[in-house]
Interface confidence: low
């Protein structure tokens, strides 16, 4: 807490400018009007205040807005955002995607902090669902964002938003998350032709049921082994040797290298040895 002291004569700030850099902490507290600061927040970022000085500026905003900052101030916080706690951010009502982008830009290139996670949570809850523009923005800054959501949270993602998802955005998703996302992707891409559809749906197949894998095996898709290894074991087990051979196409030879790993190991154990022998890979059931 900064002590309340009178502003020295002639030091009252008329505007937020670089002269304030020379003010001591108590002078900033005494001589900078909080309302002036709020209206000229966009200038703060261009002035190289020390972090100690930024603490004072934050304190002034906190006093002016005890119930939480208005969006007009939030949008221009810039590096002052790094000073905010999750508790501060929970008081905000952020509705503009531009505000979200401005604050994510401050943290760009770095791990998602608790502050950013809280900000995103507030923003998405305020919107009611994870729309395409928001998802586009979040995955651009944090490719792993989608996989950080719970299955319950993912259920609010509309199928139209799935078009914004890139393969790398799903790298860290677990089967429960893909179970939620796959039906949405199937719906989103349903009007595409065979080969284009497979390219788009491929990243989501970890959530695909057996009947969809059987259907894909009839379409000459040539699934690679990396994708096959991410399929749900319970979805792979009912597939016949012929169906797996069609599904993988020229990649079927890769089964030998993966014979000790799930789901290949469990699938092999379910097959008749005679059928496995038709692959000519020396797989032993």
């Amino acid at each position: 807490e900064v002590e309340k002291t009178a502003c020295p004569s002639g030091k009252k700030a008329r505007e937020i400018d670089e002269s304030l850099i020379f003010y001591k902490k108590w002078e900033l507290e005494a001589c900078v009007d909080a309302a002036l600061l709020a209206t000229q927040m966009d200038r703060v970022n261009a002035i190289p205040f020390t972090y100690e000085q930024l603490d004072v500026l934050k304190h002034k905003l906190d006093e002016l807005y005890p119930q939480g900052y208005p969006e007009s101030v939030i949008q221009h916080l810039g590096y002052l955002f790094l000073k905010m706690s999750p508790e501060d951010i929970r008081k905000w009502n952020v509705t503009s995607l531009e505000t979200l982008k401005a604050l994510l830009e401050v943290n760009k290139g770095h791990e998602m902090s608790p502050q950013v996670a809280t900000l995103i949570d507030r923003f998405v809850k305020g919107r009611g669902q994870l729309d395409k523009d928001t998802l586009d923005t979040l995955t651009a800054f944090y490719p792993g964002y989608l996989c950080s959501l719970s299955p319950e949270e993912l259920s609010s993602v509309p199928p139209s938003s799935i078009w914004a998802v890139r393969p790398q955005d799903l790298d860290t998703c677990d089967p429960r998350q893909l179970d939620v996302l796959y039906p949405k992707a199937r719906l989103a891409f349903q009007n595409m032709n065979g080969s284009e559809y497979f390219v788009k749906i491929q990243s989501f197949l970890g959530g695909a049921p057996t009947e969809d894998l059987k259907a894909l095996s009839q379409q000459n898709v040539s699934m690679d082994l990396a994708t096959f290894m991410k399929l749900r074991t319970d979805a792979v087990l009912p597939l016949t040797v012929a169906e797996v051979q069609k599904l993988l196409g020229p990649h079927v030879e890769g089964l030998k290298a993966e014979e000790r790993h799930r789901p290949v190991r469990d699938w092999i154990l379910r097959q008749r040895q005679d059928d496995l022998d038709t692959l000519g890979l020396g797989l032993q059931g």
């Epitope: 400018d17 670089e18 002035i47 190289p48 205040f49 972090y51 590096y79 790094l82």
Partner: antibody
């Protein structure tokens, strides 16, 4: 890709002057505060001077105050260090660096230019 | 001025080792500390900012911790390219100050 390229170093006699330049590319130069850091031969890093985004605020280490002047030309994406009354102890490689968040750490550095002060 | 004291000033280690370098400030600086790596005849490179945040593009074997006055840089699985000199720097207040450096050499 951010690039910072220093120039202007060389051999100068004690009491002489030099002007170092740092040409920046691959970044919005006018949006970042900049700094000069030096390193005497076989020694550690020493912060020399810093300048705000617009150039309106400057900072100096006590050891160079009154002798060195930092400036910038945002239209030319260039940072400068005017060094007067040079002393032997100013001999060093001079690096320009871009400052990160607020008064933050230096996220990009130039390759350095050697200044030798000797008679 | 805030003094930054690094220890050790040098150390010998082997590839695969876990290396720890400490940095102490003469007064509290919150988390406003950076770590840099410098190889001979090269410019320093930023590794860590805000005490523990990894600079973009830096391998995850580097990590930073600490706040207040005591800070640590850890290299968890020393690689041949990690033999270099490491510096800490405070940016809590002016003048900005660096530690004296820690040279990591091959054993």
């Amino acid at each position: 890709e951010v690039q910072l390229l220093e120039s202007g170093g060389g051999l100068v006699q004690p009491g002489g002057s030099l002007r170092l330049s740092c040409a920046a590319s691959g970044l919005t130069f006018r949006s970042y505060a900049m700094t000069w850091v030096r390193q005497a031969p076989g020694k550690g890093l020493e912060w020399v001077s810093g300048i705000s985004v617009s150039g309106g605020i400057t900072y100096y280490a006590e050891s160079v105050k009154g002798r060195f002047t930092i400036s910038r030309d945002n239209s030319k994406n260039t940072l400068y260090l005017q060094m007067n009354s040079l002393r032997a102890e100013d001999t060093a490689v001079y690096y320009c660096a871009k400052r990160g968040a607020a008064v933050g750490s230096f996220d990009y550095w130039g390759q350095g230019t050697l200044v030798t002060v000797s008679s | 001025d805030i003094q930054m004291t690094q220890s050790p000033s040098s150390l010998s280690a082997s590839v695969g080792d876990r290396v720890t370098i400490t940095c102490r400030s003469s007064q509290g600086i919150g988390s406003w500390l950076a770590w840099y790596q410098q190889k001979p005849e090269k410019a320093p490179q930023s590794l860590i900012y805000a005490a523990s945040s990894l600079q973009s593009g830096v391998p995850s074997r580097f990590s930073g911790s600490g706040s207040g006055t005591d800070f640590t840089l850890t290299i968890s699985n020393l690689q041949p390219e990690d033999f270099a000199t490491y510096y800490c720097q405070q940016y809590n207040s002016y003048p900005l100050t660096f530690g004296g450096g820690t040279k990591v050499e091959i054993k």
